[in-house]
Interface confidence: low
């Protein structure tokens, strides 16, 4: 065994949208750190085996398997996959260590299986196994975080049952609005599941595993805040659980709170209250309303009232099964070339929604906005002022939501022109859709003006990537025109575009824009 | 959809003066530039006006000082204001909403 060579096996991920990963087997430029696979002898195998870790992929994700090999002199090497040879392209390192490569792109069921690897050195022959499997994520889940009182302490525990098992983490933040956001120096994120500090302006709760991340807000009403225009409302549906809490500040410790339900105080054992002094010395207190599990008789209005304070309520609002409010109606757009326009969708929905914009079947990222009316918008405006059509979808656990756009982008005619022995086309995309006319050049209309109406067909045709019309003029060829020149031009209320198009000449066709 | 319904034209005399409306249904009217065509007997359609969503008006230069377009968010509805109409302004009248065409309307213009 003295003279086996040193093996490192490595898996190298890559992003998706990763344009170094090749086509071939052949060595790509590195796109995330490499994973050891371990790469250890096989024991009581016939020759020499090596195994690398069984390596386990997401469904179109795009992998390299690699081995580095430690050896003296040149090798040969193969690969096999289900009895087929692959092409082999060894290289070598800049610590001249051999580096044979197998790239993976975008990981199907039938890619899954085991690849072999035979190489051949001065020295010596070896085979390296690699077990690549599709990871089952058919059994993942991602659900929202939920809140449950800690038994015997007043303390919140946070939970959210998803598998894989999901890294829960609290995200507080202790000032108003804007500055809350995730990436503000005003946040603090705790990655535990109790959370025992309650009095902070904003808590929520998030999970996180493989399939991504979702939060849990923790609803609040602040007596100290001017209340909304409108109502805040909290949805939730049947057998979830309810979370509410009420918040005060005052100058002493003489005041109470209270939570009523359409009128009614809340039961004993459906709420439970804290409070503490802050840095100024001022009181705050929280009173906390819930119900383990919600039924439809749980929805009214949920009343906070304090001795010091004015009132104020939420509506809540239990569904049997989730939604997504907004106007599906298609709408169109005109905008000129250079201005600032973003499409954007008004929506309620519950749970929240995931989305994506998608154009020419390109997707982007979708981000939500909350109003204080309690709807969410959504703005897209990275459409680089391209014309088409642009989707808006979005889905819950419940519910599905497909808006279409149109965006047209005001410019003046491009003229392209194509001839053949017996016709010559003009075609254009500017907007508003152009209308055409052609013109006959001779000795007795020098200037093109001379109009022709006769064997002239215009239409206009969809083209269908961009969901983009675009507008074609065809001229039939009479003898009246062979071997003329003659002009099409496409005119919108921004502009006219002309091409001049010999007809009928030997050779290809020159084409003279003129605008 | 977008449905236009163009109307206010007719018969009057050189020298005088006519309010064309183009009113529209869908959403979509007050974020969309208007557009005033016109199209004369045996003659190609021309562009006469347009009115952008923010309200900037831009003309047909040998029309400027004639024609005024406006609109009425409120009402979903374009003007276009004629005046010391020309027996040469005789022609049907379209207002435009993206690919949108009204039915247009008559104006007739006598000397």
């Known amino acids: 065994n003295q003279d086996l060579p040193v093996i490192k096996c490595v898996l190298i991920n890559h992003k998706n949208n990763d344009s170094s990963v090749g086509k071939s087997s052949s060595y790509p430029m590195v796109s995330e750190s490499p994973e050891d696979l371990g790469c250890a002898l096989r024991p009581q195998s016939s020759g020499t085996v090596y195994e690398a870790a069984a390596v386990e992929v997401d469904v179109s994700a795009s992998i390299t398997l690699q081995v580095l090999v430690d050896a003296p002199g040149n090798i040969s090497c193969l690969w096999v996959f289900k009895h087929s040879s692959l092409n082999c392209q060894p290289h070598f390192d800049l610590q001249n260590r051999g580096v044979v490569s197998m790239v993976i792109l975008k990981m199907t069921e039938t890619q899954a299986g085991e690849y072999l690897l035979f190489i051949q050195s001065e020295a010596t022959n070896y085979t390296i196994l690699f077990t690549v499997s599709i990871r089952n994520t058919l059994l993942y889940t991602l659900r929202r975080p939920y809140f449950r009182k800690m038994e015997n302490q007043d303390a919140l525990v946070c939970i959210s049952e998803s598998v894989p098992e999901p890294i829960v983490e609290w995200v507080l933040c202790d000032s108003q609005g804007e500055s809350c956001k995730e990436e503000s120096p005003a946040v603090v994120k705790k990655e535990e599941k109790v959370l025992h500090e309650l009095f902070g302006t904003d808590i929520r709760c998030c999970a996180r595993n493989e399939l991504g991340r979702e939060c849990t807000r923790l609803f609040t009403i602040d007596l100290n805040q001017t209340p909304q225009t409108t109502l805040p409302q909290l949805f939730l549906k049947v057998g979830e659980p309810l979370w509410i809490r009420c918040k005060a500040v005052h100058v002493n410790h003489g005041f109470g709170l209270t939570w009523e339900l359409e009128n009614k105080a809340l039961e004993e054992g459906n709420y439970f209250e804290m409070s503490t002094y802050s840095t100024n010395r001022t009181m705050i207190r929280i009173l906390f309303a819930f119900v383990s599990s919600v039924a439809r008789n749980d929805t009214g209005y949920y009343t906070c009232s304090s001795s010091k304070h004015p009132s104020q309520s939420a509506l809540v609002t239990i569904v049997e099964k989730g939604f997504i409010n907004a106007t599906n109606s298609s709408e169109d757009y005109e905008i000129d070339q250079y201005e600032e326009f973003c499409f954007s969708v008004r929506f309620k929905a519950y749970p929240q929604i995931r989305c994506t914009w998608t154009f020419s079947r390109k997707s982007f990222p979708c981000e939500q906005k909350g109003l204080d009316n309690g709807y969410s918008i959504s703005k897209f405006c990275n459409h680089k002022h391209q014309p088409g059509e642009y989707i808006f979808h979005a889905e819950n656990d419940d519910a599905q939501f497909t808006k279409m756009f149109t965006l047209n982008i005001r410019r003046k005619p491009q003229v392209l022109a194509e001839a053949s022995a017996s016709q010559a086309s003009c075609f254009s995309d500017g907007y508003p859709l152009p209308s055409w006319t052609w013109k006959k050049c001779s000795d007795k209309s020098p200037n093109c003006t001379e109009e022709i109406t006769e064997g002239v067909w215009n239409r206009k045709a969809n083209r269908k990537v961009f969901g983009q019309w675009v507008s074609s003029s065809t001229l039939n060829m009479s003898e009246a025109i062979k071997g003329f020149l003659v002009k099409c031009c496409a005119y919108n209320s921004l502009g006219t575009s002309c091409e001049t198009i010999l007809l009928n000449s030997p050779g290809p066709f020159p084409f003279i824009q003129d605008n | 959809q977008v449905q236009l319904q163009e109307s206010g034209g007719g018969l009057v005399q050189a020298g005088g003066s006519l309010r064309l409306s183009c009113s529209a249904s869908?959403?979509?009217?007050?974020?969309?530039?208007i557009d005033w065509y016109r199209q004369a007997p045996g003659k190609q359609r021309e562009w006469v006006a347009q009115?952008?969503?923010?309200?900037?008006?831009h003309y047909e230069p040998s029309l400027k000082g004639r024609f005024t377009i406006s609109r009425d968010n409120a009402k979903n509805t374009a003007y276009l204001q004629m005046n010391s109409l020309k027996p040469e302004d005789t022609a049907v009248y379209y207002c435009?909403?993206?690919?949108?065409w009204g039915q247009g309307t008559q104006v007739t213009v006598s000397s």
């Open positions: 435009r909403i993206l690919d949108y």
């Open positions: 869908g959403s979509t009217f007050s974020r969309n530039y």
């Open positions: 009115i952008t969503s923010g309200g900037n008006t």
